[in-house]
């Protein structure tokens, strides 16, 4: 029972946090205007993977797409590919732990192939966490890089008349998004491979004992039914267990005010 | 068509208050920011603040914010300013604005005039 | 907060020609993000609000003649009208749409001359 709640936990939160790295992925606000020392501005910029937008104090809200990929920084390609490749780890290992859960039966298929499955989907949720994690704190590093880079440059050069205040770039709330996204899928992953462990029971041998009667020749083996780990043995006893795991999976949708038609 | 219908003329006294309305039509009165602007004879146009109606947000010109009040009633679509402790450099013409692309003001009331006087 | 300088303060031009005035802002009115500029043109006659004339310092507002048209980046912009008309004589105004508050310049007279 234990097993199956946590493969089933392990599968949730593992739903939950690619869901999340999808979120993140596709989310605009990946970096944000810091307005620490510009708290009055009027317009609004904030950017993504795929496109940077300019909200007005209007309320008009204009995106553009990247539409160049070999003008792009190394770095921004980089945390695309992570995020990517994440997501489709990620996909994938949910495909696969479907077919794993102990609670869903699909024809003969024995405990050591599910527990083969568990394992595999585990590993592919961790390696999609780290993925997502790895992307983010690129993605971080780059904006924390460039905020002291673009600082030291607005206490330079002020000497004449007019002021032009560089727009400087903090933290978005795509990236805790994605932190949190990736750790949720890490300790998803991590689960599947626990419950992995239960699934596969350790092979028993247990001695046949002879009992010799008179007259009758009867071998007694004990032991309700024999515990197997060999790939390609037949459990025939198996328990099913109606796993009743749901998933609630708020997507918070920020409230933009107008385009103009 | 977009319309501001802004309240007649008004003269007051010193140290009293005003409170000048504006009137929305011909679009979604929640969705749009009401800007009010002042000008007073020979001076430049002022803006004074906006209100968001939409959840009554709002955003004063240091200049004004001890002395100006912007509210909405969006059942009404009209939006309000008052202006406290009145003195005569008060005095002028106060326009509400309904802005457009680039912080702009497409759309505006005819104004209303404020006269400040002992 | 941003100051607007317009200059000249009044302007004489005879009909059918072109005029030309200017507008300098304290502070850079640009947006990096979209790179477009956050000035506005507006017309006001005696007695009437303000118009709309050009937003993002070069788009015209529609139903405004072509003869007007907008251009500069940054601190420096200009209004001009290819061919003034009679119905042109006004006072322009400048706005930066950029930072709170918005201020305005203090306008430019135009007149025939």
């Known amino acids: 029972m234990a097993v199956t709640a946590c493969q089933g936990l392990g599968f949730v939160v593992s739903l939950i946090g690619i869901a999340g790295i999808i979120a993140a992925t596709c989310m605009d606000q990946w970096s944000t205007q810091d307005l620490y020392n510009n708290p009055v501005t009027a317009v609004f910029n904030y950017q993504g993977l795929w496109r940077s937008c300019v909200r007005e104090s209007s309320g008009f809200t204009e995106c553009r797409g990247y539409f160049t990929l070999l003008g792009l920084p190394a770095m921004l390609q980089a945390v695309r590919a992570l995020m990517i490749v994440g997501i489709v780890l990620g996909a994938i290992g949910l495909l696969v732990s479907i077919f794993a859960l102990k609670c869903i039966r699909i024809g003969s298929m024995e405990d050591s192939a599910k527990a083969n499955m568990t394992l595999t989907s585990g590993i592919m949720f961790i390696v999609s966490g780290l993925c997502a994690i790895a992307g983010v704190s690129v993605f971080a590093n780059m904006l924390v890089t460039n905020f002291w880079m673009s600082t030291a440059n607005m206490y330079t050069g002020m000497g004449g008349m007019v002021q032009t205040v560089q727009t400087r770039y903090t933290f978005g709330a795509a990236l805790f998004v994605g932190w949190v996204a990736g750790g949720l899928t890490l300790i998803g992953g991590v689960m599947m491979c626990i419950a992995c462990r239960g699934l596969a029971p350790e092979e028993t041998n247990y001695k046949a004992v002879s009992y010799h009667a008179s007259g009758h020749s009867v071998a007694y083996k004990p032991g309700g039914f024999k515990a197997s780990t060999g790939f390609g043995s037949n459990t025939k006893n198996k328990k099913i267990y109606d796993g009743g795991a749901r998933t609630e999976d708020e997507v918070q949708s920020y409230p933009s005010k107008h385009d103009y038609v | 068509q977009v319309q501001l219908v802004q309240s007649g003329a008004e003269v007051k006294k010193p140290g009293a208050s005003v409170k000048v309305s504006c009137k929305a039509s011909?679009?979604?009165?929640?969705?749009?920011?009401i800007h009010w602007i002042k000008q007073a004879p020979g001076q430049r146009l002022e803006w004074m603040g906006y209100?968001?109606?939409?959840?009554?947000?709002?955003n004063y010109n240091q200049k004004f914010k001890a002395r100006v009040t912007i509210t909405a009633d969006t059942s009404a679509s009209t939006a309000y300013m008052e202006l406290s402790s009145l003195r005569s450099e008060d005095t002028a013409v106060y326009f509400c604005a309904r802005d457009y692309y680039g912080n702009s003001f497409a759309y505006w009331g005819q104004g209303t005039l404020v006269t400040v006087s002992s | 907060d941003i100051v607007m300088t317009q200059s000249p303060d009044s302007l004489a031009v005879s009909l059918g020609e072109r005029a030309t005035m200017s507008c300098k802002s304290s502070q850079s009115l640009l947006n990096s993000g979209n790179q477009k500029n956050y000035l506005t043109w507006y017309q006001q006659k005696p007695g009437q609000p303000p118009k709309l004339l050009i937003y993002w310092a070069s788009t015209r507002e529609s139903g405004v003649p072509d003869r007007f048209s907008g251009s500069g980046s940054g601190t420096d912009f200009t209004l001009t009208i290819s061919s003034l008309q009679a119905e042109d004589v006004a006072v322009y105004y400048c706005?930066?749409?950029?930072?709170?508050?918005?201020?305005f310049g203090q306008g430019t007279k135009l007149e025939i001359k």
């Open positions: 209100i968001y109606p939409g959840n009554g947000g709002t």
């Open positions: 011909g679009y979604t009165f929640t969705s749009h920011n």
């Open positions: 706005q930066n749409g950029y930072r709170f508050p918005f201020t």
